[in-house]
Interface confidence: medium
Amino acid sequence: RAPRCRELPAQKWWHTGALYRIGDLQAFQGHGAGNLAGLKGRLDYLSSLKVKGLVLGPIHKNQKDDVAQTDLLQIDPNFGSKEDFDSLLQSAKKKSIRVILDLTPNYRGENSWFSTQVDTVATKVKDALEFWLQAGVDGFQVRDIENLKDASSFLAEWQNITKGFSEDRLLIAGTNSSDLQQILSLLESNKDLLLTSSYLSDSGSTGEHTKSLVTQYLNATGNRWCSWSLSQARLLTSFLPAQLLRLYQLMLFTLPGTPVFSYGDEIGLDAAALPGQPMEAPVMLWDESSFPDIPGAVSANMTVKGQSEDPGSLLSLFRRLSDQRSKERSLLHGDFHAFSAGPGLFSYIRHWDQNERFLVVLNFGDVGLSAGLQASDLPASASLPAKADLLLSTQPGREEGSPLELERLKLEPHEGLLLRFPYAA
């Protein structure tokens, strides 16, 4: 008799793929545009990325550091009207893209939560949750919660409101903290909360340290669903050298949890390469005309247009990974087992029941390495075969689909491999 199939876990929409943050509408759209109507025109692009949710804003009225002139129920007229927002919501729903609204109150000010009047601000957030839930948003994000006094209890209350409305709604909290104990204390009282932090930004870009951080986090959080990013808002290029972007994309898409990206991460958008652009929100490079300030500063391979036409680009890799992440059971909700593969390497298996299994091997080092995969680290349920098929490499030149002998696996500097192999009883 065939073994009985393992029961599928409950899958919420944010479990099925990546979230895409657009914190600055104007920078995302560029050319002096930057409103909700314009964003609606970019939804097809988001669909092409196969992302499941758009984390938008903040877009509410906020006069810097002025509680009285901050209205979480009103859209700043610079971004558009409530009708524009409703229209965006309807269009996003038709394309199966969920909309999460950032309600961080004082986003233009010094302290995101104002330094005084915590209760007044918290009441404003409560009212806003109810208002926007009724308007049809799929969830909320609040950032910089380290600046919010009694954050845990407020988050618990807001989570209660959000989930009480419908269990299909999501609350995301963001913190600048990278301290695991602080992160765990926030998660402790809010089991369903999705928390973005700077935890992984401390990885030092080495395989051993990254492996240690990931496994510590997963062990500490147990079987709860988590998210993966390098910060609550910033671009990957703020933390990583260009040669590691592909590696991190592969890792973020294949770890167990929801990957969260900022606009531009898919093309390696880098503020440092665009003189005069703000580090936290550089202009999105749709094509070479997106940054007219310095002629010749932007080459085609830095832009969406240029990378869309190149199957070997970072954008093409992002699209492929996003597609795999959203349709393979082992990547959607599979078990995770990290194991030793040699210095500078981070490797792990994702597997679910009798479905196709995935092996990820990441070389963080700047030298080529032979991978010594220590299958003895793995439980019997996740044993390694002698060969696995190469699904993709982060570097060009490998023959995809070809079987690779795992005992003789060699990786190029900064190369990541995604291999697949069948379940064997």
């Epitope: 409950a10 409560k126 009212d127 109810e130 989570q159 209660n160 419908s166 369903d192």
Partner: antibody, heavy 119, light 106 residues
Framework: EVQLQESGPSLVKPSQTLSLTCSVT????????WNWIRKFPGNKLEYMGY???????YYNPSLKGRVSITRDTSKNQYYLQLNSVTTEDTATYYC?????????????WGQGTLVTVSA | QIVLTQSPAIMSASPGEKVTISCSAS?????MYWLQQKPGSSPKPWIY???ILASGVPARFSGSGSGTSYSLTISSMEAEDAATYYC?????????FGAGTKLELK
């Protein structure tokens, strides 16, 4: 302990308005979501709508604008009004409070009040 | 709205017998919730988040399923289990219920 108690007339004439009160003890209606649900003679349950902690409301579209839910926070009571009733509205009406949060589910129900619509 | 279809509508089981009640959703839901109602009483929360038993529910009850297909199982029927069981979704408004399964003791 949270308790909900429905009250109101048990007989309403067709085309008139059905009005019910839900009195809440052990919890404040300024927290959470407070629902009305009805059960028809054939045992079918129908969700009618809620009034939330902030006073905002949601109504089931199937009730085609005939329903209104209001509250009086000073009395810790909330109310149901159903206009233009027909015999099809004969049912047991329940007020209910649900809490879904993390790994918690509480559903507090009143004992229900049978309302018959008849001439 | 999400339509929940329960089956069977009515069934009877002898003491000790295994009972399974099914609930099918018209579109995918994250979790299913189950209520028990006995004549003259209000519905009681019985199983939540698909498989977690509410306080005081005997361990012979279990829940399972995912997507659009869910079920409630009683491993060994007892007299006190005779009741009507409803499935319910909290995925989206309006909240909806199955038509109920009336379980009788044979």
């Amino acid at each position: 302990e949270v308790q909900l108690q429905e009250s109101g007339p048990s007989l309403v004439k067709p085309s008139q308005t059905l009005s019910l009160t839900c009195s809440v003890t052990g919890d404040s209606i300024t927290s959470g979501y407070w629902n009305w649900i009805r059960k028809f003679p054939g045992n079918k349950l129908e969700y009618m709508g809620y009034i939330s902690y902030s006073g905002s409301t949601y109504y089931n579209p199937s009730l085609k604008g005939r329903v209104s839910i209001t509250r009086d926070t000073s009395k810790n009571q909330y109310y149901l009004q159903l206009n233009s009733v027909t015999t099809e509205d004969t049912a047991t009406y329940y007020c209910q409070r649900h809490v879904i949060y993390d790994y918690t589910w509480f559903a507090y129900w009143g004992q229900g009040t049978l309302v018959t619509v008849s001439a | 709205q999400i339509v929940l279809t329960q089956s069977p509508a009515i069934m009877s089981a002898s003491p000790g017998e295994k009972v399974t009640i099914s609930c099918s959703a018209s579109s995918s839901v994250g979790y299913m919730y189950w209520l028990q109602q006995k004549p003259g009483s209000s519905p009681k929360p019985w199983i939540y988040r698909t498989s977690i038993l509410a306080s005081g529910v005997p361990a012979r009850f279990s829940g399972s399923g995912s997507g659009t297909s869910y079920s409630l199982t009683i491993s060994s029927m007892e007299a006190e289990d005779a009741a009507t069981y409803y499935c319910q979704q909290y995925q989206s408004y309006p909240l909806t219920f199955g038509a109920g399964t009336k379980l009788e003791l044979k």
